[in-house]
């Protein structure tokens, strides 16, 4: 867990868990079905997914100056994706296989977000899009797109934690 009241997370733990997330996100992705995306437009559920951008302080200099900006952004994204993975997009039909990595992925997102949440401090979480129940036929594409954007997100987060573990750990 983050150091109580402090500004530094347990970088090494976060690095390990973010690497696990990367592995899970890649292993889950092909299991949601091979999709032909040529005729598919963007879906509103995946339009507003969090991205880590230049102004988020996740570059080496930003992390040195004040890592909290970047960590808050990562935390928001983790919560966002954790909610999406618990929505009926993933829990409804068509059913995921019992041994699907999506369950582990969901738990690991929650685990990393808890590591980042300092004791007694609650960051504002980004608004989750209000998800009206999706139709089963839409879910295959939505899962594909959500996992694809999650892969990109956790890849950046893993690089941040790797840098933090190497240069910012006490």
């Amino acid at each position: 867990r983050a150091v109580p009241g402090g500004s530094s997370p347990a970088w090494t733990q976060c690095q390990q868990l973010s690497q696990k997330l990367c592995t899970l996100a890649w292993s889950a992705h092909p299991l949601v079905g091979h999709m032909d995306l040529r005729e598919e437009g963007d879906e509103e559920t995946t339009n507003d997914v969090p991205h880590i951008q230049c102004g988020d302080g996740c570059d080496p200099q930003g992390l040195r100056d004040n890592s909290q900006f970047c960590l808050q952004r990562i935390h928001q994204g983790l919560i966002f994706y954790e909610k999406l993975l618990g929505s009926d997009i993933f829990t409804g039909e068509p059913s995921l296989l019992p041994d699907s990595p999506v369950g582990q992925l969901h738990a690991s997102l929650l685990g990393l977000s808890q590591l980042l949440q300092p004791e007694g401090h609650h960051w504002e979480t980004q608004q989750i899009p209000s998800l009206s129940p999706s139709q089963p036929w839409q879910r295959l594409l939505l899962r594909f797109k959500i996992l694809r954007s999650l892969q990109a997100f956790v890849a950046v987060a893993a690089r941040v934690f790797a840098h933090g573990a190497a240069t910012l750990s006490p």
């Epitope: 999709m35 005729e39 618990g86 409804g92 039909e93 019992p98 998800l131 089963p136 036929w137 295959l140």
Partner: antibody
Framework: QVQLVQSGAEVKKPGASVKVSCKAS????????MHWVRQAPGQGLEWMGY????????NYNEKFKGRVTMTTDTSTSTAYMELRSLRSDDTAVYYC????????WGQGTLVTVSS | DIVMTQSPDSLAVSLGERATINCKSS????????????LAWYQQKPGQPPKLLIY???TRESGVPDRFSGSGSGTDFTLTISSLQAEDVAVYYC?????????FGQGTKVEIK
Amino acid sequence: QVQLVQSGAEVKKPGASVKVSCKASGYTFTSYVMHWVRQAPGQGLEWMGYINPYNAGTNYNEKFKGRVTMTTDTSTSTAYMELRSLRSDDTAVYYCARNWDVGYWGQGTLVTVSS
Amino acid sequence: DIVMTQSPDSLAVSLGERATINCKSSQSLLYSSNQKNFLAWYQQKPGQPPKLLIYWASTRESGVPDRFSGSGSGTDFTLTISSLQAEDVAVYYCQQYYSYPFTFGQGTKVEIK
């Protein structure tokens, strides 16, 4: 193994409410939606709606909106279906069922509405 | 809502003979991006909940005997019992899970001739 165990038969008067429970075991309760389906005597199957135990999100068949409420208690892995303003044509066996394409159903609960 | 229509309503077949049940949907159940049909077949015996036989129109549920097979695509589907056994006497339902509300066919009663 996955099991869905429902509460016992009920006899209700017209205008009353009934609440049927469905206790799940053998899987992670919050990982799958729970559907409710009913079957009137000698009739076919009718989908009533579902609840997502993870976030309590519901999706009801328009036919039952305003009369049905689906809830869950994640601490006991139990789903509930309450039907209000009962009429005689609500007499049916009510089933809970986990995602259709994996085929797990409760044993059914007979609800008889009679004056 | 998608309307599911089964035929025939009832069917009497000799033991060991083939039984064929048809199911027609009012709109296509085929999702073109992965070429899957969102259709399931159930078997229901008196006093029991329905039992899943087939999903994705043609994928047999584990433990279901291989005499049961599903075929078809789009709006027209078929459940075939290649060699009817005494324990197959039941009502059979098709069901679409392409969109809400999920809907079922009216059922086909299979008996022994």
